[in-house]
Amino acid sequence: EVEKTACPSGKKAREIDESLIFYKKWELEACVDAALLATQMDRVNAIPFTYEQLDVLKHKLDELYPQGYPESVIQHLGYLFLKMSPEDIRKWNVTSLETLKALLEVNKGHEMSPQVATLIDRFVKGRGQLDKDTLDTLTAFYPGYLCSLSPEELSSVPPSSIWAVRPQDLDTCDPRQLDVLYPKARLAFQNMNGSEYFVKIQSFLGGAPTEDLKALSQQNVSMDLATFMKLRTDAVLPLTVAEVQKLLGPHVEGLKAEERHRPVRDWILRQRQDDLDTLGLGLQG
């Protein structure tokens, strides 16, 4: 902790400006008013403070706001955000999407840090649900964000937010997560016509039940093998050879290359050989 010493005559800071980079740590402590700093946080980012100087500035804010910074300060933290611990962030009440964006921008290009994860958690809990604008923002910064949530957390995503989800946002989701997201997607896209509906729902089909796959097989959707391989095994097993043929359309030939992998392997073992032979792919049940 920096020792408390009187501010030298004439050095009391009236503004947060460039001159402060020449202040020693003890001078910053003694001469920079915490309330002034809180008010002019937006200026800190334009000044090349050292890490040690930033520690002093953070200490001053912590002393003024030990129970958590007000949002007016949080929004302008800039790179001082990188000095915050998850414990600091848990004290915050962040309600503005602009504040969230400003802080995510600071961490842009890096992996999601514990600080960012805590910030997002505080923000989402404060809002009560993952609304579309929030999801848009989070997936723009962290494409894998959605798949980092537990099924319980995903249950708070309203169907309307599903419109913000891009296929790549679901790349790392496991079946349990897709089980939660699929019904929401189905609800969100229910008023779309056949081909448009399939384009939108395709990424979520890893959570689809058998009856929905059967329904899709009647719509000439031509599902690609990559999507088929992500389907739930228990949903694929009851499908007939004819239904799989209709579901995959021209992509059915790809089954041969995947015959040793789930769910294709398990599905083949459930079929009558006569039915498999109708595909002319040499699949052995």
Partner: antibody, heavy 114, light 110 residues
Framework: QSVKESGGRLVTPGTPLTLTCTVS????????MGWFRQAPGKGLEYIGT?????RVYYASWAKGRFTISRTSTTVDLKAPSLTAEDTATYFC???????????WGPGTLVTVSL | DVVMTQTPASASEPVGGTVTIKCQAS??????LAWYQQKPGQPPKLLIY???TLASGAPSRFKGSGYGTEFTLTISGVQCEDAATYYC????????????FGGGTEVVVK
Amino acid sequence: QSVKESGGRLVTPGTPLTLTCTVSGIDLSSYAMGWFRQAPGKGLEYIGTINIGGRVYYASWAKGRFTISRTSTTVDLKAPSLTAEDTATYFCARYYNGGSYDIWGPGTLVTVSL
Amino acid sequence: DVVMTQTPASASEPVGGTVTIKCQASESIYRVLAWYQQKPGQPPKLLIYDTSTLASGAPSRFKGSGYGTEFTLTISGVQCEDAATYYCQGGYYADSYGIAFGGGTEVVVK
């Protein structure tokens, strides 16, 4: 979470006195604590604060007249020599946020008289 | 040290009316201003901190505003239980100007 002051009594001028602020449910390593006083029928007056690091800050008029110290559950206010002007109810309070104090004790009355 | 000047010294308002109390700091205290309510024989009770943030348990009819040297506490739709003395408190213990209270405003509810 509560705060209670004790040690207030009738004393003669020049007498030293120690007031004790006892906290319950408040971790003094997480909260700064302040001392204030209020003369009968008058307004509130700030004496000083001890922060979580143990550093003490005093109002300019109180420097040399009072000493603030703490243990793990108490915060003491020592006055080496009281005068009639020090007659007041003394309050201890928890520093909260943004310059404010949120949990106040009921106060302890100090009367300095011949 | 910062000096806080509070006006008026007293205010009388019927139930349902609006009370406005002003507080002026001798130098800029930015947003570091709190308002307290005190009833006879009781300690002060925190109402507002950081100029405009309502303290936990404080009724929403209390509103704080201002910045720098000029601050206002407004009580809209004043109730009988609001009869008390109100103090502004400016400044911050860790900085050179320290903490100072306004002289108080006694609010009488008719």
